[in-house]
Interface confidence: low
Amino acid sequence: EVEKTACPSGKKAREIDESLIFYKKWELEACVDAALLATQMDRVNAIPFTYEQLDVLKHKLDELYPQGYPESVIQHLGYLFLKMSPEDIRKWNVTSLETLKALLEVNKGHEMSPQVATLIDRFVKGRGQLDKDTLDTLTAFYPGYLCSLSPEELSSVPPSSIWAVRPQDLDTCDPRQLDVLYPKARLAFQNMNGSEYFVKIQSFLGGAPTEDLKALSQQNVSMDLATFMKLRTDAVLPLTVAEVQKLLGPHVEGLKAEERHRPVRDWILRQRQDDLDTLGLGLQGGIPNGYLVLDLSMQEALS
């Protein structure tokens, strides 16, 4: 902390300008009025202050606003944002998307820092949900943002926001996250026609249940193998050979290359070998002809 010393004669700052870069830390503390700094925050970014000098400016703002900075100051923090701690940011009430964008811009190109994460958390909580404009902004700065959220956090995403999601935004999502996102996507895209619907829903299908996959198999969608391999194993297992053939269309040929990998491997084990042979792909490992298959899960449900 900087000692309180009187400002030397003639050095009192009338405005925030380049002359201040020649001030020592104690002179900044003594000669820059905090209220002046707050009203001219936008100028700070244009002036090449040292990190030590920025510490002093931050200290002055902290003294002026012990309960947290107002949004008018936050929006113009610029590089001073990098000096903020998560504890500082938790005191803020950020409601403007423009403020969020301005601060994300400062951190652009760097990993998502704890400060940025706290800022986003405060902003989203303040809005009550992750609306489309916010999601657009966040995924523009951090393409994998959606997949960094827990399933609980994702549950607050309204279906309307799903329109902002691009396929690459889901690249790192795990099955539990897709389980939450898929029903929202289904709702969001429900009024689209068959082929358009499939293009939009495709990235979310890792969360789709069996009945939806069965429905898609009736729509000539020609799902590619990469999408099929990301489907939930428990959703794929009940599909018949005919349904998988319809679902994949010309891509069915690719099953051979994936026969040792899940979910194809597990699906093969559930099919009759006779049915698999109808595909003409040489898939092996199905249930031999003449064996009786008991569905114990149905029996358990009834007892």
């Epitope: 704890p114 994460a117 994998g144 790192t172």
Partner: nanobody, 118 residues
Framework: EVQLVESGGGLVQPGGSLRLSCAAS????????MGWFRQAPGKGRELVAS????????YYPDSVEGRFTISRDNAKRMVYLQMNSLRAEDTAVYYC???????????WGQGTQVTVSS
Amino acid sequence: EVQLVESGGGLVQPGGSLRLSCAASGFTSNFYSMGWFRQAPGKGRELVASINSFDSITYYPDSVEGRFTISRDNAKRMVYLQMNSLRAEDTAVYYCAARKKGLAFSYWGQGTQVTVSS
């Protein structure tokens, strides 16, 4: 520069246990998700466990659920994989991996061999 160094691999009998450790250095913060992948001969790399730094939420595929447990010690910059009830099919090179939060796994260790055999 980010570095990940695995240890704890070895030969173990079916049904046995092993604990893998991963020492992480060079991170500017703990703001990373960590994961363990494995690669058996002639197969692709598969994720066996991951943990978020933010909320410590973990993820396991069906093949290891209930047998493997991932944990982390942020203060020591360590990530662990406790593997119980090991099976022959768990034989593979195990890799520690890290990702910037919300981005793909982009940092990898050199790997440690785990062999399950009687």
